[in-house]
Interface confidence: low
């Protein structure tokens, strides 16, 4: 342990204010009381300290709270949060959504850092589930947050939280994640009428099973091609030409542009060419007349 230098006469800090930006590092160390700093943390953020000075202030807090900072200090860390390591954050017990918001605000505009990821992890684990308010907050700061969770983690999202999800929050989700989220969305929006329901459920349809797509085809929903292209291939394959036509409505013409891409390509291969011809789009690759079409599950059983 390095011997501590005494604070020069008249320099003892009575409060955390702008005069401290003119202190050298050793003067901050010697003249700022850690307990005073802890009680006036809210002032630190308004003062343009250098990063070296912030290191000194962090060191003082670390000495005062070796087991981890209390939430009253954490909430007012401001830019000092950027100095924290994931190891520091693992010692914290953050329970207030206001604290979480305050720290996310500091990191706003930056990519999600390891510190932020650790903070969110601590917060969510402390709450036991991703409730609506938390999800609302996290997706507001990080639209891709939901899709960064594993299917196992997503299983702890209650259906009520789904109301906080915006379409852009699901942009980077893969089919496994949508498989978990779709049933929750279906439950969350079950009491809405047809057209409103479709607007809400549309972003989640990448996790929808065949029977739900068949049901939607009966409701004049006019699904756009972008949504159709994100559907599970195994859910699309059993749909008939008539069902796809009803599902897409006026957008059915877009199938021609997508005929070489999944799931359209695979779906075409499963349809009778005669049925495809009824669409008048020039789709090719269907099953010629006179050929026997085996059910997909039978094909798998036979192979």
């Amino acid at each position: 342990e390095v011997e501590k230098t005494a604070c020069p006469s008249g320099k003892k800090a009575r409060e955390i204010d702008e005069s401290l930006i003119f202190y050298k590092k050793w003067e901050l160390e010697a003249c700022v009381d850690a307990a005073l700093l802890a009680t006036q943390m809210d002032r630190v953020n308004a003062i343009p300290f250098t990063y070296e000075q912030l290191d000194v202030l962090k060191h003082k807090l670390d000495e005062l709270y070796p087991q981890g900072y209390p939430e009253s200090v954490i909430q007012h860390l401001g830019y000092l949060f950027l100095k924290m390591s994931p190891e520091d954050i693992r010692k914290w017990n953050v329970t207030s959504l206001e604290t979480l918001k305050a720290l996310l605000e500091v990191n706003k505009g930056h990519e999600m850092s390891p510190q932020v990821a650790t903070l969110i992890d601590r917060f969510v684990k402390g709450r036991g589930q991703l409730d609506k308010d938390t999800l609302d907050t996290l997706t507001a700061f990080y639209p891709g947050y939901l899709c960064s969770l594993s299917p196992e983690e997503l299983s702890s999202v209650p259906p009520s939280s789904i109301w906080a999800v915006r379409p852009q929050d699901l942009d980077t989700c893969d089919p496994r994640q949508l498989d978990v989220l779709y049933p929750k969305a279906r439950l969350a929006f079950q009491n809405m009428n047809g057209s409103e329901y479709f607007v809400k459920i549309q972003s989640f349809l990448g996790g929808a099973p065949t029977e739900d797509l068949k049901a939607l085809s009966q409701q004049n929903v006019s699904m756009d091609l972008a949504t159709f292209m994100k559907l599970r291939t195994d859910a699309v394959l059993p749909l008939t030409v008539a069902e796809v036509q009803k599902l897409l409505g006026p957008h059915v013409e877009g199938l021609k542009a997508e005929e070489r891409h999944r799931p359209v390509r695979d779906w075409i291969l499963r349809q009778r060419q005669d049925d495809l011809d009824t669409l008048g789009l020039g789709l090719q690759g269907g099953i010629p007349n006179g050929y026997l079409v085996l059910d997909l599950s039978m094909q798998e059983a036979l192979s």
Partner: nanobody, 117 residues
């Protein structure tokens, strides 16, 4: 690292005015604090004025009431309006930017201010 370029230095009579400018290569939204430092002949570089990302401004006692720091995030520029200049304001003036997350301070090359009595 942020690149900083100062301009506006030069010679002035005591009681006169100068405006120093500092243009940053990065968006000022990503900079946590900006400051003007000065160094008269000798090794010591002192902080003259600083502005935090929240817009809070601070001044060294020697320049309070005479100098004004400001910035414009859109043009990535910071200024130091220097009024009622004194011979003791003669120094090389440096623009500095703090990035707390990266733990970096970036410096400009400096601009010379000379005040004659």
């Amino acid at each position: 690292q942020v690149q900083l370029v100062e301009s506006g230095g030069g010679s002035a009579q005591a009681g006169g005015s100068l405006i120093l400018s500092c243009v940053a290569s990065a968006n000022l939204f990503t900079i946590d604090a900006l400051g003007w430092y000065r160094q008269a002949p000798g090794p010591k570089r002192e902080l003259v004025a600083a502005i935090s990302s929240g817009g809070n401004k601070y001044y060294a006692d020697a320049v309070k009431g005479r100098f004004t720091i400001s910035r414009d995030t859109l043009t990535k520029t910071m200024w130091l309006q220097m009024n009622n200049l004194k011979p003791e304001d003669t120094a090389m003036y440096y623009c500095a930017a703090e990035d707390y997350g990266l733990g970096q301070r970036s410096w400009g090359m400096g601009t010379q201010v000379t005040v004659s009595s």
